[in-house]
Interface confidence: low
């Protein structure tokens, strides 16, 4: 029959070439002379000329060694024609299968593989995977089947079999306990890949296993006892730097220290922070210490890490004895701000109040007093007793110095310590009103027509406080009542001035006396410009220029 079974040809054949593979034969050669030819990749198309056929005998020829890793199978077509060129058979499929030889070594995908694993992990923990490839056939033969093994381990501590590798997957795992970063931070394994499933050619690569830090070392105080001296009252004062050592990886959470004051700080006077670079514990005062209350504090500080311990570890504790140093403290006025009511206008030399300070220090220090700020210069202070007296006239209505009836004075106390210290107090004098001001009209100049004049409404003001103000009373004096009338309104806070008789155009003085609820009287002269006009006027019509 015009059929050829698949032909198997080993790669890398030694020849001699051309090498006869198989004979094409048509049974039509009984009837006529047959000529044979082949077509397809490897014959008449690239790679051309690998195969040929003897035209008259039909022998299929191989012209050169084959490479399975380049082309593993060729598909050709065989043709049979008669002498006159007529096709005597349909094209026949010829399959040539290239069989594998173990002509390639395994190759690792990297020269160096890097992996990492936490120190102290259990045996069986997977670390990393290495991969090697082999171009040979791993399906039909063992030529391309790679087996992995560990050739050597450096360093060989705590012993030389810390890791194992899965023969077929290349997964490296921990096989032994005892990984300790602080002793061996990195292992270098020489790994092998061998084809023929471990029986053939071998190649090597390096696997670097980084041992990652676990918090398996506790920080330890060095030293464990400290003595420090701190001046009283200092806030934010650095008391002491506590030093710890930790074998874990520097600058990692397993190394960075966390400090805690475990005892001795009942008043919450201290705080401790971690220095970001040195890892020291910086003990500082959160609030001022008081020598008089307690001159020594014994603190107990515990240190752990930012990361939790991975196993039970003892916690290191330090003892810090803090000696509080006495400081001459400033006298303190009691109260810091004192409010005193005093009547305005009291006689000079009259006592206002006694304002004294206390010294927090235990020694009986002498305190002297003086006025620090007295804007109007109204007061004096006895340096020994703290007695404040009036030396000027206290005036509630003085808007420059008095705000909302209050006159503010700052006083100073100084002790006789070495060096002396000072404290200040604020004296707030609430000035009680006295009826020392009479009512005053506004405005004090008016312009009015002498025919059908408009009534002039004047506002009444009094600097005093109620009840020394409205209701007011008005009275015209010095014959002003012949031409004018003055009436206070119902509310008692304005006075209405009216022209009751004709006056020629000119300027006149109207004598108006106003008195307040406390009968304090004030005489005011109103300048009245009378114009020749009717009703409302603001300025007299020309040509008159005024008097």
């Amino acid at each position: 029959d015009w059929v050829v079974a698949p032909i198997s040809v080993p790669e890398n054949g030694k020849g001699p070439f051309p090498q006869r593979l198989n004979q094409l034969k048509s049974n039509k050669d009984r009837d006529t002379k047959i000529f044979y030819s082949i077509t397809g990749p490897g014959a008449d198309s690239p790679p051309e000329g690998v195969f040929a056929v003897e035209k008259e005998t039909g022998w299929l020829l191989l012209n050169k060694p084959l490479d399975r890793e380049e082309i593993a199978k060729y598909e050709l077509f065989g043709h049979a024609v008669s002498e006159n060129g007529a096709s005597v058979e349909d094209p026949m499929n010829i399959s040539i299968i290239v069989t594998d030889q173990n002509d390639h070594k395994p190759k690792f995908t990297q020269d160096t593989f890097r992996g990492s694993v936490l120190e102290g992990v259990m045996p069986g923990t997977s670390v990393m995977q290495v991969t090697a490839t082999d171009e040979d056939d791993a399906v039909n033969t063992y030529n391309g089947v790679v087996a992995y093994s560990i050739h050597s381990q450096e360093p060989k501590e705590p012993h030389d079999l810390m890791f194992t590798i899965h023969k077929s997957t290349g997964t490296i795992s921990v096989i032994s306990s005892g990984l300790d970063r602080e002793k061996v931070p990195e292992y270098r394994l020489t790994v092998q890949a061998t084809d023929m499933d471990g029986e053939g050619s071998t190649t090597t690569a390096e696997a670097v296993v980084q041992i990652l830090d676990a918090n398996d070392n506790a920080p330890e105080f060095d030293p464990q006892k400290y003595e420090a001296h701190v001046p009283e009252n200092a806030v934010g004062h650095e008391v002491q730097r506590l030093t710890v050592t930790d074998l874990d990886a520097p600058n990692s959470p397993a190394w960075r220290a966390t400090y805690l004051i475990m005892g001795g700080d009942d008043g919450d006077h201290f705080t401790i922070t971690t220095h970001p670079e040195s890892n020291q514990g910086i003990l500082t005062t959160r609030k001022g210490l008081d020598f008089e209350a307690k001159n020594q504090h014994t603190l107990y500080v515990e240190v752990t890490n930012e990361a939790p311990f991975v196993l039970k570890l003892p916690t290191s504790t330090a003892t810090i004895v803090v000696h509080v140093e006495d400081v001459n403290e400033a006298p303190v006025f009691v109260p810091p701000s004192k409010v005193v009511e005093v009547q305005e206008g009291i006689p000079t030399g009259e006592p206002v109040c006694v304002y004294t300070a206390e010294d927090p220090d235990k020694e009986n220090q002498k305190i002297s007093y003086r006025i620090l700020r007295d804007p109007a210069g109204w007061l004096a202070m006895d340096p020994d007793s703290g007695q404040v007296t009036a030396v000027g006239t206290l005036d509630r209505e003085d808007e420059q110095f008095v705000r909302n009836n209050i006159y503010e004075v700052m006083v100073l106390a100084m002790d006789n310590g070495s060096p002396p210290t000072t404290g200040t107090g604020t004296l707030l004098l609430t000035l009680i009103d006295v009826n020392d001001h009479g009512p005053v009209p506004e405005p004090r100049q008016i312009t009015i027509c002498n025919q059908s004049p408009v009534r002039q409404v004047l506002n009444i003001t009094d600097k005093d406080l109620s009840p020394h103000t409205s209701p007011f009373q008005a009275q015209l004096t010095d014959d002003s009542d012949i031409y004018w009338t003055a009436e206070v309104n119902e509310e008692g806070d304005t006075v209405v001035l009216s022209l009751k008789k004709f006056l020629k155009q000119d300027t006149y003085d109207v004598h108006l006396s106003l008195s307040d609820h406390g009968n304090k009287e004030q005489l005011t002269v109103i300048r009245a410009t009378v114009c020749d006009c009717h009703g409302h006027v603001e300025t007299c019509p020309g040509p008159w220029k005024g008097g």
Partner: antibody
Framework: VQLVEESGGDLVKPGGSLKLSCAAS????????MSWVRQTPDKRLEWVAT????????YYPDSVKGRFTISRDNAKNTLYLQMSSLKSEDTAMYYC???????????WGQGTTVTVSS | ELQMTQSPSSLSASLGERVSLTCRAS??????LNWLQQKPDGTIKRLIY???SLDSGVPKRFSGSRSGSDYSLTISSLESEDFGDYYC?????????FGAGTKLEIK
């Protein structure tokens, strides 16, 4: 092959700001601390900043503290250096390098040039 | 700040020659020291870490050692690709500090 590649260097005026980037590949970026190191025109190398593998901790010398900020995006395998209030003495070639505890500066980039001049 | 004093600042040597570079630490840094090589194109490569551990892919002619506060990098037999700038860097104390560098040239 372990690769780190810096970018973002430029000419900037004194007092100005600049952000450098460093793209990493070929190693497990998220398990490595990373650093910036600079080389001044007189060829001196100077450490600039270090950041921990998770990005939670960062460290600086006094010369850049408060002006430079190191950060990282482990999802993008990228390291950054934000520089502000730049001075003429910050002119340098800036390199990024791995900072694995106990074994720092294993992998280095090619560098990116920063020039601070008016 | 911890100082790293590197010497010599430059060195001219012949192929095949044995050369040593030194860094002196002003304070104790334990074994926390690296040696770096910089080529003329600016490329930086780590040769040695932790005083004496050789980096992967670095030829065995390079070695690192320590004597007290002096740290040395030795090249047993110079080859043409060894020329360039060499720096030490300490990471045992913050801030991290570098030596001023040694320029290694062909004689």
């Amino acid at each position: 092959v372990q690769l780190v590649e810096e970018s973002g260097g430029d000419l900037v005026k004194p007092g100005g700001s600049l952000k450098l980037s460093c793209a990493a590949s070929g190693f497990t970026f998220s398990t490595y601390g990373m650093s910036w190191v600079r080389q001044t025109p007189d060829k001196r190398l100077e450490w600039v900043a270090t950041i921990s593998s998770g990005g939670h901790y960062s460290y600086y010398p006094d010369s850049v503290k408060g002006r430079f900020t190191i950060s990282r995006d482990n999802a993008k395998n990228t390291l950054y250096l934000q520089m502000s209030s730049l001075k003429s003495e910050d002119t340098a070639m800036y390199y990024c390098a791995s900072y694995y505890y106990g074994s720092p500066f294993a992998y280095w980039g090619q560098g990116t040039t920063v020039t601070v001049s008016s | 700040e911890l100082q790293m004093t590197q010497s010599p600042s430059s060195l001219s040597a012949s192929l095949g020659e044995r050369v040593s570079l030194t860094c002196r630490a002003s304070q104790d840094i334990g074994s926390s020291l690296n040696w770096l090589q910089q080529k003329p194109d600016g490329t930086i490569k780590r040769l040695i870490y932790d005083t004496s551990s050789l980096d992967s892919g670095v030829p065995k002619r390079f070695s690192g050692s320590r004597s007290g506060s002096d740290y040395s990098l030795t090249i047993s037999s110079l080859e043409s690709e060894d020329f360039g700038d060499y720096y030490c860097v300490q990471y045992g104390s913050s801030p991290l500090t570098f030596g001023a560098g040694t320029k290694l040239e062909i004689k």
